[in-house]
Amino acid sequence: NKGTDDATADSRKTYTLTDYLKNTYRLKLYSLRWISDHEYLYKQENNILVFNAEYGNSSVFLENSTFDEFGHSINDYSISPDGQFILLEYNYVKQWRHSYTASYDIYDLNKRQLITEERIPNNTQWVTWSPVGHKLAYVWNNDIYVKIEPNLPSYRITWTGKEDIIYNGITDWVYEEEVFSAYSALWWSPNGTFLAYAQFNDTEVPLIEYSFYSDESLQYPKTVRVPYPKAGAVNPTVKFFVVNTDSLSSVTNATSIQITAPASMLIGDHYLCDVTWATQERISLQWLRRIQNYSVMDICDYDESSGRWNCLVARQHIEMSTTGWVGRFRPSEPHFTLDGNSFYKIISNEEGYRHICYFQIDKKDCTFITKGTWEVIGIEALTSDYLYYISNEYKGMPGGRNLYKIQLSDYTKVTCLSCELNPERCQYYSVSFSKEAKYYQLRCSGPGLPLYTLHSSVNDKGLRVLEDNSALDKMLQNVQMPSKKLDFIILNETKFWYQMILPPHFDKSKKYPLLLDVYAGPCSQKADTVFRLNWATYLASTENIIVASFDGRGSGYQGDKIMHAINRRLGTFEVEDQIEAARQFSKMGFVDNKRIAIWGWSYGGYVTSMVLGSGSGVFKCGIAVAPVSRWEYYDSVYTERYMGLPTPEDNLDHYRNSTVMSRAENFKQVEYLLIHGTADDNVHFQQSAQISKALVDVGVDFQAMWYTDEDHGIASSTAHQHIYTHMSHFIKQCFSLP
């Protein structure tokens, strides 16, 4: 780094709020799409190039001029697995976090022309190619259709779809947000013969209603109504079906075969939480009780003689938790061996750490193939010889991520493939494997600038650097950048990790204001080795504020003892631990304990508000963006996972004593900025409205900002700039900065 240890002698510019808002310094990605075991697509200057992984040579797959006459702005593209067609997406209209509608056209790569007959309708909700060949499944008006050939008519699979009532092949609001993290509820079998799908019924689910003000010319605001089950309310019901796409015909309705949930699920409310094809004719389904400490995996086989699916009770696998809930957020997905007779799955071991267990479909017990006081984050690939996984084992740092391979014939033979590649620069990796895992792209995202490299699985040798962000590195040499410290403190004989974004030329003998950046939701992690250019970068670089984050009880990837500590008790230990962290930080000698602030968004807004309302005396001020204020206002799937039901027999007492509103009186001791989008479909404006009302009722003076028609992300260009400018002013005023 240029410059000197002396801040006054460093003439370089700082990273400003404008730099953040205008994205002056852009991290370069290298987003590839594998199309085979040795080729990938990469977009360069709007040309789509196809690269040979082994040799690195490329050719133009599709010129940027191909669609000059198309007449629409293409939002995304998707190439059929056989490489014959390209699906073009346009007229994109966002719905919720993952869902959107769009228009689609199909381009025939052999004929070099758009297919004009039998087009997919406008406002399609989801489209997906079959895993091989070029069949298409799509959802329109909540019903599923299949195209055997892009130019042939669609076969209608379902006839029951109804807006906000019956969803075929797509998720309703709560399944999208909290279960599948996707709009799609369609699953092709590996060779594209079968199409499995879920059907959600929201008939009895209560509606959240909010105003959408839209253009100034709209005299009466629109009312948005969304089926949204809040904690304890009526939930959607789910059914699961499989259709054989070889059976489809225009002159008879498609026959979908239902696979019912296990008897142990049908006794009460339950969720479908995972669908994984094991083989061409074997499918695994995971079901979860509404009280999310008990799940069942069914393994179902196609019976050709009857055309039905049989799920043997002897093949059911039960997963349960006695200390909390199943999975990090839901039960993990199984990774089946080629024959479909066994699978690997991440589950909690006896010590409460999440590791890989090997299951045989006909046996109840499994064999753990990894162990230790660390956790496996994800299984990334499975071949006949090796299983590849990401874990945070290396150097005992929960906030790190590295790629490992384990030999399936000898579980003691484990190799870290990324640990020693670039240990200073790269401690946080993700990976993208080619179709049969012959090659892989490593994506290093910190602590140094992101680095993308390509590797061969044959000998795990690095083939080439794809992107090293050297141009950005050169630019940042001329900027006074903050440094990042990642360390831990010990509380009650337990390590708790924190990170600090430290101002340039940090001097531990000086006193700095500190902003605690909090999330603190169950299984969260804010202390990590990732490089980021964000609001904190500006605050540290330009305003000389330390921005710290702390992973206390409830946080993830460090075992269930820590994560399940807040089971049935949201708003307790995770809140107390943020206050304790701030106390510990102020004892470190370089924090001005009269200038400590806290801020957070969503769950972080809830924790911020609970902290500020605790009367601890530690914090001068804070900002809560889109906070939860009372758990009965939030959705059933997320809330009940951790809190159970808001009934007297279950956990109503804690629902009622974990509200922000009950702490209103204590806000007289702090400066509070409350922010919310009026069109937040996720954490409803209601939640902040109730905080505001409670504060007004006890005479608390506070600051507030609403963002008209903004959702949970407050992400429109103007609103994004406004909120961060507004929060910057608030923090500077709180810290008495010029």
Epitope: P153, D246, S247, S249, V251, T252, T255, E304, S305, G307
Partner: antibody
């Protein structure tokens, strides 16, 4: 390899019952429908009916009262039964595999002659 | 029922000739039309499905076109083995119906 092998034709008396067999190999009768058509001497093709993969049946109205199409999936066999045969039922009868909206494989045909 | 009318009922042509056969539906059948070839003493075989799509293994001298009610089968250069009967068939609605056939004979 997909194949449809037919049997059961021959000479029938008027009023008798006809039972034709179509044995499939290389595919499953629970996946694909099997259609039956017939072709009178020197004439065109006439659709009789179908049994779908899930066992449902559809018939041409002209044959509804005296035709039954069935199958035994364990034997991979489809059947056409026609009652009350008359001279005009004399034809070559074909079974075919239904592939979406077309017939991609045909049986070799079986000749039925109704004569007193 | 949907009536399928084929024309001509027969035609004479020589090898190398271009031949077109028409098929008309009594109502709109979109593109749900198939063409079959039948040689004497044999079962019919699929040539074209869904108006214009060539079935696998069928020579590309065969082509189909049309939509709605009017359809055409074209043989661009007649080969000796193409002398046979040709049938159209609608697949949009039960009962399925066939055209009465066109016999292509050697001139």
């Amino acid at each position: 390899e997909v194949q449809l092998v037919q049997s059961g034709g021959g000479v029938k008396q008027p009023g008798e019952t006809l039972r034709l067999t179509c044995t499939a190999s290389g595919f499953s009768l629970t996946t694909y429908g099997v259609h039956w058509v017939r072709q009178a001497p020197g004439k065109g093709l006439e659709w009789v009916g179908v049994i779908w993969g899930d066992g449902r049946t559809d018939y041409d109205a002209a044959f509804m009262s005296r035709v039954t199409i069935s199958k035994d999936t364990s034997k991979s066999t489809a059947y056409l039964q026609m009652n009350s045969l008359r001279a005009e039922d004399t034809a070559v009868y074909y079974c075919m595999r239904n592939r979406h909206d077309w017939f991609d494989y045909w049986g070799q045909g079986t000749t039925v002659t109704v004569s007193s | 029922d949907i009536l399928m009318t084929q024309s001509p009922s027969s035609l004479s042509a020589s090898p190398g000739d271009r031949v077109t056969i028409s098929c008309r539906a009594s109502q709109d059948i979109r593109n749900n039309l198939n063409w079959y070839q039948q040689k004497p003493g044999q079962a019919p075989r699929l040539l074209i499905y869904y108006s214009s799509n060539l079935h696998s293994g069928v020579p590309d001298r065969f082509s189909g076109s049309g939509s709605g009610t009017d359809f055409t089968l074209t043989i661009s250069r007649l080969e000796p083995e193409d002398f046979a009967a040709y049938y159209c068939q609608q697949s949009i609605k039960l009962p399925l119906t066939f055209g009465s056939g066109t016999k292509v004979e050697i001139k």
